[in-house]
Interface confidence: low
Amino acid sequence: MGHLSAPLHRVRVPWQGLLLTASLLTFWNPPTTAQLTTESMPFNVAEGKEVLLLVHNLPQQLFGYSWYKGERVDGNRQIVGYAIGTQQATPGPANSGRETIYPNASLLIQNVTQNDTGFYTLQVIKSDLVNEEATGQFHVYPELPKPSISSNNSNPVEDKDAVAFTCEPETQDTTYLWWINNQSLPVSPRLQLSNGNRTLTLLSVTRNDTGPYECEIQNPVSANRSDPVTLNVTYGPDTPTISPSDTYYRPGANLSLSCYAASNPPAQYSWLINGTFQQSTQELFIPNITVNNSGSYTCHANNSVTGCNRTTVKTIIVTELSPVVAKPQIKASKTTVTGDKDSVNLTCSTNDTGISIRWFFKNQSLPSSERMKLSQGNTTLSINPVKREDAGTYWCEVFNPISKNQSDPIMLNVNYNALPQENGLSPGAIAGIVIGVVALVALIAVALACFLHFGKTGRASDQRDLTEHKPSVSNHTQDHSNDPPNKMNEVTYSTLNFEAQQPTQPTSASPSLTATEIIYSEVKKQ
């Protein structure tokens, strides 16, 4: 769409002339029944830009049309009129010289100001002299300047001060947004917005609140973001750390200690040795140290702005002893032995000197029984004889006053060939024992009967002591892992003690019992 080639002239066109013009115009297109409307493009306009009031469904047969400022037709507020026949635009009282009307009735307003905001009414004069009207509107907003951030405290103290940022300028009809580290504001009780979001207050600042902070101002036609602002948060000093972390040094070495405490502004450091001031530096260097340099080394950190001080004390020991003990090796003469029969020697070997050795079995310090002996400066552990309870994990530890190290563990297995109690007796063995016991009891009964029958005067005094032992489960029922929980696994040992005296007149029918025999009959109750 081009502008009108001719400038807007203040021309009065008599209605008779308009009627004559209309009569000369012939429109063959059928009239439209659609509603006359006007649309603002854009609806929100930046100040200084232009807006087009676009017309839809313009009737075909018409004399002309006229635009007015406001929501109604008011001659005093006419902007421009247009007569189709003469293609002549006539400015009205409300014309500012920035308006252009097009043959399709659309109105262009250039270099808009905020005073242009509001309603505009189009009046269409049809060839039958019936008028139609349509009203549209637009809103003019200022082009926003680049904002800036002012602060009431650019050097706040951590955990003490609050900081209020204000976004300038204070513009009307503007939305204020804030960004921290290029992120929108997090939800935090320490962040408060006020003054229509123009002021951002940080309560009780921390060292992590340095920013950067940006504010953005927005209206429907423009947005602008400030330059970033950072906070110089004063804090610290935190508790200093002394590095390196080593405690032990050899004589002749150089002692170089460095102290650091997080602080803003950076901390001022001083060193004390055994409570005596040495120097005001961050690093302490002592060449060619001796045992006399052992002691407590204090780093003192001070922040002159916060007025806070922190100290850290480190103990330094200068010694010939090795600060690192090598891992010892453990060897066994055998790792699988027979209980109550074999012995075993465990040896702990190390290349370090000036060290001591200790032994551990199932986290217990050794030796733990008379059968265990340490020899060769504790390097060898001897177990003689090995018992069932000696089975398990052994390891040794080498140490000096400043360091220690452990060997890898070694496993000692203990077997019992005669009576592998862990696995119980086979049904055949149990049957054999039961039969033997029954037979023995029967034999004894026959012998007794004989003695009683013959009524010998030189009778053996016969004492029987029949006892029943029910040992606790914990002592006698290891490794019954398939038994259901909470079910008692009882092993009953019946012990028959025979105290036999030699009969004065032995009888061939009765065997002589020369020793007390103890026979275990193991019966598992399931």
Partner: antibody, heavy 121, light 107 residues
């Protein structure tokens, strides 16, 4: 050029009401707020508050809450200061001053010539 | 409220002399400070905005500066029309506050 022209001097009795006008020209009135400033005879300047010329919302300093009212006639690009129930201590010169863009330090970039209010029996 | 303490309240000086007026802010106001000049007839105009920026049409002998919380207006070489009243104004937070003023008199 930008101008703020205030109404003429006023002579009032205690208890009366005075309304001072400040007509702006040379700029878009609704783009900039308007401040009001009091200067008692032989004294310094005191900020009374301001009015948002876009929304019409006034803001008053603590000492000027109650009897003082800011208003607008936007179509005439005019701001008004009304003082009700005049007291002797209200005798002063009152200035309007445009509230410019604060970004450029505009705070009070253009001033009216002042309106003298005399309160006398 | 932010207090603006202006000194001196009056100052006698000679033509061509260099003078400085000072305003001290009770809180941090950043650069949000203007200097105003008031003629004997009551007319007020702004000389300096944002601490140190010169308004258009203001002679270059006027300058503004800041040192911490002290803000200064310096006139490098006094001329006869400079012997009037001067005020500072802070606008960082509401209520906006003025200094008490300095009356510059010819010696």
């Amino acid at each position: 050029q930008i101008q703020l022209v205030q109404s003429g001097p006023e002579l009032k009795k205690p208890g009366e009401t005075v309304k001072i006008s400040c007509k702006a020209s040379g700029y878009i009135f609704r783009n900039y707020g308007m401040n009001w400033v009091k200067q008692a005879p032989g004294k310094g300047l005191k900020w009374m508050g301001w009015i948002n010329t876009y929304t019409g919302e006034p803001t008053y300093a603590d000492d000027f809450k109650g009897r003082f009212a800011f208003s607008l006639e936007t179509s005439a690009s005019t701001a008004y200061l009304q003082i009700n129930n005049l007291k002797n201590e209200d005798m002063a010169t009152y200035f309007c001053a445009r509230r410019g863009w604060l970004l450029t330090g505009g705070a009070m970039d253009y001033w009216g010539q002042g309106t003298s209010v005399t309160v006398s029996q | 409220d932010i207090q603006m303490t202006q000194s001196p309240s009056s100052l006698s000086a000679s033509l061509g002399e260099r003078v400085s007026l000072t305003c001290r802010a009770s809180q941090d106001i950043g650069s949000s400070l203007n200097w105003l000049q008031q003629e004997p007839d009551g007319t007020i105009k702004r000389l300096i905005y944002a601490t140190s920026s010169l308004d258009s049409g203001v002679p270059k002998r006027f300058s503004g500066s800041r040192s911490g919380s002290d803000y200064s207006l310096t006139i490098s070489s006094l001329e006869s029309e400079d012997f009037v009243d001067y005020y500072c104004l802070q606008y960082v937070s509401s209520p906006w506050t003025f200094g008490g003023g300095t009356k510059l008199e010819i010696k």
